[in-house]
Interface confidence: low
């Protein structure tokens, strides 16, 4: 049955849900965080959790500025117990087919099992296979980085172009940007969009003699990726005397489809596989991360995996009350379903993390943008937050206005590393950045009332414009430094937050049927763009747009 992992259809059936509704009505919606701090001197002590990574580095998660008290936290934990979040978690870590609609295991956690403990899917221990792919990645990345691997004219590789989309692009893009400080000898470029501009601009800046193309597609049939890959291949051949034998030195595949890879002309020795139990948005830990290993070096890539593994260990072994990702997920449910919040802001106070919100956007929204439960009924509650974000302090000069004084409740995560990789001007920049990190969370919580505004000299009609309601929730995440291990841990934290939300909402966080319909219709329309006839097969709007496009193209 599709519902073999949970014994409830809707989260609203759970007794703790009703209890939380009542708590929200009686105290949640009027709870003042400022007053909670005044009432409880130990509030910060109780509501901050420190995660210790495998290398001893630490990340502090401060939940104390959230709209909760002891009773609310207890009721949320009760909800997690009733929804059997830990049961589903354990099923995932045992390799059971918790992706029920596609009848697949969800085993990205096995990719970072650097302890090499046995991890089974359908009776097979996958740890040796994962290890052998990583060994292949290590060997290959070290050959390329050292210059031992040479292009067809005997020159060292200087540039890597990763061609992929979705999970085969966003993860590596984000991670290589985040860990730029650890980059070595190679430059990496990423081509994802089918818009010809993306590949055209990239090919302008690389040299065919010193460029390695990675074609990243699980099935090796993704329309955008294969189209871009063929364009890259044609460009390469046109620049290298049209000799297909040169392809072997300049193209590698990150895929599971050996037949299509060989057909494309790539030597299958340069093919890095991964299994059907790795979902695209969870694939940066797999062979899809080869561009990362090439860029920052294999040892750093392994540290990245180990950081995630350390969070996996925390998530599976820590009691619910202190379980950091679980608490993060429960808070998200609290705001989504009881306060009616529809968004979740992630603002990294770190320029290196500028693609982190975009990565989390796919992780969260593709996972939990569902409206049917594991019990095959429509939800009677909101799911899937709209996740957005930009690096601060830039964000403070754009959408923070709405966060502070708008009509919507926007639960926010702020992320900062105490140590900068670039402590320039005697740490002046870092101190300014940090002061904003602390000040924004404080301002959102304390606000500014009418009396303060008047005391500062405002009068008349200007007063309400300068009032800040405060009581706007934030979670502050303070790391020591953004290292590969820290980044791995942060991603895994958000993966398990997403997992917790999905488990409580009783939805399948691991399929993505929503991407299918548009793909199918695009194929149909693609054929219609190949001829000059007037189109009348769609609705009036679609017909009108297609016909205007054809006229202008």
């Amino acid at each position: 049955s599709n519902n073999s992992f949970t014994n409830f259809k809707l989260a609203t059936e759970l007794p703790a849900w009703s209890k939380l509704q009542k708590i929200y009505e009686s105290q949640g919606k009027t709870l003042s965080v400022k007053q909670e701090f005044q009432k409880d001197a130990k509030r910060f002590e109780k509501l901050n959790k420190t995660f210790t990574n495998y290398d001893g580095s630490k990340i502090l998660f401060d939940y104390s500025k959230n709209l909760v008290n002891d009773e609310i936290i207890a009721a949320l934990i009760e909800l997690a117990k009733e929804a059997n979040v830990t049961g589903l978690r354990d099923a995932m870590f045992k390799g059971e087919h918790i992706n029920s609609t596609e009848d697949r295991a969800v085993y990205h956690v096995a990719l970072r099992n650097r302890a090499n403990k046995p991890m089974y899917v359908d009776g097979v221990n996958v740890a040796p296979e994962v290890d052998s792919v990583l060994k292949h990645m290590k060997e290959f990345s070290e050959q390329v980085r050292s210059g031992e691997w040479k292009g067809y004219t005997g020159k060292k590789i200087t540039d890597v172009v990763n061609i992929g989309i979705g999970g085969s692009d966003l993860g590596p893009v984000m991670v290589t940007e985040a860990l730029k400080h650890y980059a070595g000898v190679l430059d990496v470029h990423f081509v994802s969009n089918i818009d010809g501009t993306h590949i055209a601009e990239t090919l302008k800046v690389v040299d065919p003699e010193t460029t390695l193309f990675l074609i990243a597609s699980k099935t090796f049939t993704t329309a955008e990726t294969i189209t871009n890959a063929n364009t890259a291949k044609n460009w390469f051949l046109s620049k290298t005397g049209n000799d297909p034998s040169h392809i072997a030195k300049h193209f590698a595949a990150l895929s599971t489809n050996e037949t299509e890879v060989a057909k494309f002309g790539i030597d299958t020795k340069n093919m890095f596989g991964f299994e059907s139990w790795v979902g695209g948005r969870y694939s940066v830990w797999s062979a899809i991360g080869l561009s990362v290993a090439l860029y920052i070096g294999y040892d750093n890539f392994e540290a990245f995996l180990k950081g995630a593994e350390a969070v996996d260990n925390h998530f599976t072994q820590t009691p619910l009350e202190d379980n950091i990702p679980l608490l993060g997920g429960l808070l998200s449910v609290w705001y989504n379903n009881f306060f009616g919040a529809q968004t979740h802001l992630v603002a990294p106070f770190d320029q290196y993390l500028h693609r982190f919100p975009a990565y989390l956007q796919q992780l969260s929204m593709e996972s939990n943008g569902k409206s049917v439960t594991r019990g095959n009924v429509f939800t009677d509650y909101s799911t899937g937050s709209i996740l957005f974000g930009e690096p601060a302090t830039n964000a403070q000069h754009s959408f923070f206005q709405l966060v502070h004084q708008g009509t919507k409740l926007i639960p926010s995560d702020f992320i900062l590393a105490a140590q900068s990789h670039n402590p320039i001007e005697n740490k002046l920049h870092q101190k300014m950045l940090a002061s904003n990190f602390f000040a924004q969370a404080e301002a959102l919580m304390v606000g500014k009332d009418e009396e303060q505004v008047k005391a500062e000299g405002a009068t008349g009609g200007l007063v309400p414009h300068k009032v800040f309601s405060g009581n706007r929730p934030t979670t502050s995440i303070l790391a020591q430094k953004i290292t590969p291990a820290t980044l791995g841990a942060l991603i895994a934290y958000y993966e398990h937050v997403t997992f917790t939300e999905g488990a409580i909402w009783n939805i399948n966080s691991f399929d993505q049927w929503g991407v299918e319909l548009g793909k199918v219709l695009a194929k149909v329309i693609g054929k219609e763009l190949d001829n000059s006839s007037t189109i009348s097969t769609h609705d009036a709007s679609t017909n009108g747009l297609i016909n205007q496009f054809k006229e202008w193209m």
Partner: nanobody, 119 residues
Framework: QVQLVESGGGLVQPGGSLRLSCAAS????????MGWYRQAPGKEREFVAG???????DYADSVKGRFTISRDNAKNTVYLQMNSLKPEDTAVYYC?????????????WGKGTQVTVSS
Amino acid sequence: QVQLVESGGGLVQPGGSLRLSCAASRSIVTINVMGWYRQAPGKEREFVAGATSGGSTDYADSVKGRFTISRDNAKNTVYLQMNSLKPEDTAVYYCNLRGTGYNYGENYWGKGTQVTVSS
């Protein structure tokens, strides 16, 4: 837009019964949460009972065991059977429809029906 029309209110003696109905102007099959709220003079509107499309029901502690909510999707109607009425049940009773899933964000209220419990 969905119009909600409540009926069935009136004057009743303590210990008596009433059955409130709320008719929606369109199908309620996918509109998952339908509920009753009430507002007594000088007080805030409070939750009384709710019923989801998944078949689960929920009640305020003060009415548990006395009130029963039910819905008839075929008739686009939700009912509130009120037994053992007490003077403190006197209020205007409002029907609420909250859409989720594909209809998330829809939230409609009826105009209310007066219930007075008095001897």
